[in-house]
Interface confidence: medium
């Protein structure tokens, strides 16, 4: 009824002293390798000469921190970031940061990055939309409170507000141009 060698699980490491023989009812706890996190039970139990339980280690690391327009990363760059690792941004002059200066790797996903907005409140060119265009000639800079309108290409219908406005260096939400069959 004893168990012999410990089972191996991907990216899981048995804790404690390894033994040749484990008695019935004995438990062994596993821990996960760097970048991995235990999903569910972390131990196996010796029952009737067999090990029961299946510790599962899942990858919780992140790669490629989000790109922030008009900003650069000031913390050390890594090929892989463990969960809990933070990355700090800085805005290029003359842009000002709005939002959390850092993103964090949270169980495989990056938290929401900040935005770097023109401190004068001006906006860049309006965002492009699929199957639609703005009705005026696009400028490189727009004054605060200025607005533009979108129109859809033939056979597409506009969903949302056709007019967007520049507020605090940000354009309001642009509309969508949808094919009639998906409305």
């Amino acid at each position: 009824t004893d168990c012999l060698s410990l089972p191996s699980f991907e990216n899981a490491i048995p804790m404690g002293e390894k033994k040749d023989v484990y008695k019935a009812g004995e438990q062994v706890t596993y821990t996960c390798a760097t970048y991995y996190k235990m999903d569910g039970a972390s131990n196996v139990t010796c029952i009737n000469s067999r090990w029961t339980g299946r510790p599962t280690c899942r990858d919780t690391s992140c790669v490629n921190p989000p790109t922030v327009q008009n900003a650069y990363i000031v913390s050390r760059q890594m090929s892989k970031y463990p969960s809990g690792e933070r990355v700090r941004y800085q805005c290029r002059s003359p842009y000002e940061m709005f939002g959390d200066e850092e993103v964090m790797c949270l169980n495989g996903n990056w938290t929401e990055p900040p935005q770097c907005k023109d401190s004068t409140g001006k906006c860049g060119p309006p965002p492009p939309i699929d199957n639609g265009d703005i009705t005026s000639f696009p400028l490189s800079v727009y004054a605060p409170a200025s607005s533009v309108e979108y129109q859809c290409q033939n056979l597409y219908q506009l969903e949302g507000n056709k007019r967007i406005t520049c507020r605090n260096g940000q354009w309001s939400e642009p509309p969508k141009c949808l094919h009639p069959c998906v409305i």
């Epitope: 000002e96 959390d100 200066e101 964090m104």
Partner: antibody, heavy 117, light 107 residues
Framework: QVQLQESGPGLVKPSQTLSLTCTVS????????VYWIRQHPGKGLEWIGV???????EYNPSMKSRVTISKDTSKNQVSLKLSSVTAADTAVYYC???????????WGQGTSVTVSS | DIQLTQSPSSLSASVGDRVTITCRAS?????MHWYQQKPGKAPKPLIY???NLASGVPSRFSGSGSGTDFTLTISSLQPEDFATYYC??????????FGAGTKLELK
């Protein structure tokens, strides 16, 4: 360990400015943003504003004209000023640390403020 | 602005019950946070970004959902779980918003 502690007068007269201080320990204000949140008696939570680690601020649009949040990093303090208060500003005021994704991980115990003449 | 609607607003349950609280956003959002608050105390984080358990929170709590519908589940209610629960969202283009709360009471 991480701690946040709100302080300020418990009673403020209508039309005056409410001033509260959040003193933090266990972390640096140069690394973390701090939020102010309030809770009216028997009601839900309402976001007032946030000051980010770099010093920029964001406010609830419904209070923006009356709110100022600032900080003194060397004193580990964040302050909240709310002008032209009325009885509707009577609430428990909390400060909380930013965790990421606009979530809060550590909160102060709250300070109760009554607006009354 | 995004509105968060929690349901139910109050809920009576017994120790050992499985409880689900729903938070519905008025438009699609990327994630939701959940907090627990007991009378006279500050809120305490439970779930970050829809499904990530906050530090020190028992595994009987779980979060799920995407788009407009998010849920907080307590798999087996314990006496200390009777409290008010709030969902919360914030994006770069919308103010930080809390749901109105769900009060979980002992049946």
């Amino acid at each position: 360990q991480v701690q946040l502690q709100e302080s300020g007068p418990g009673l403020v007269k209508p039309s005056q400015t409410l001033s509260l201080t959040c003193t933090v320990s266990g972390f640096s204000l140069t690394n973390y943003g701090v939020y102010w949140i309030r809770q009216h008696p028997g009601k839900g939570l309402e976001w007032i504003g946030v000051i980010w680690s770099g010093g920029t601020t964001e406010y609830n649009p419904s209070m923006k004209s009356r709110v100022t949040i600032s900080k003194d990093t060397s004193k580990n303090q964040v302050s909240l000023k709310l002008s032209s208060v009325t009885a509707a500003d009577t609430a428990v005021y909390y400060c909380a640390r930013n965790f990421g994704n606009y979530a809060m991980d550590f909160w102060g115990q709250g300070t109760s403020v009554t607006v009354s003449s | 602005d995004i509105q968060l609607t929690q349901s139910p607003s109050s809920l009576s349950a017994s120790v050992g019950d499985r409880v689900t609280i729903t938070c519905r956003a008025s438009t699609s959002v990327t994630y939701m946070h959940w907090y627990q608050q007991k009378p006279g105390k500050a809120p305490k984080p439970l779930i970050y970004a829809s499904s990530n358990l906050a530090s020190g929170v028992p595994s009987r709590f779980s979060g799920s959902g995407s788009g407009t519908d998010f849920t907080l589940t307590i798999s087996s209610l314990q006496p200390e779980d009777f409290a008010t629960y709030y969902c919360q969202h914030r994006s770069s283009s919308n103010p930080l918003t809390f749901g109105a709360g769900t009060k979980l009471e002992l049946k």
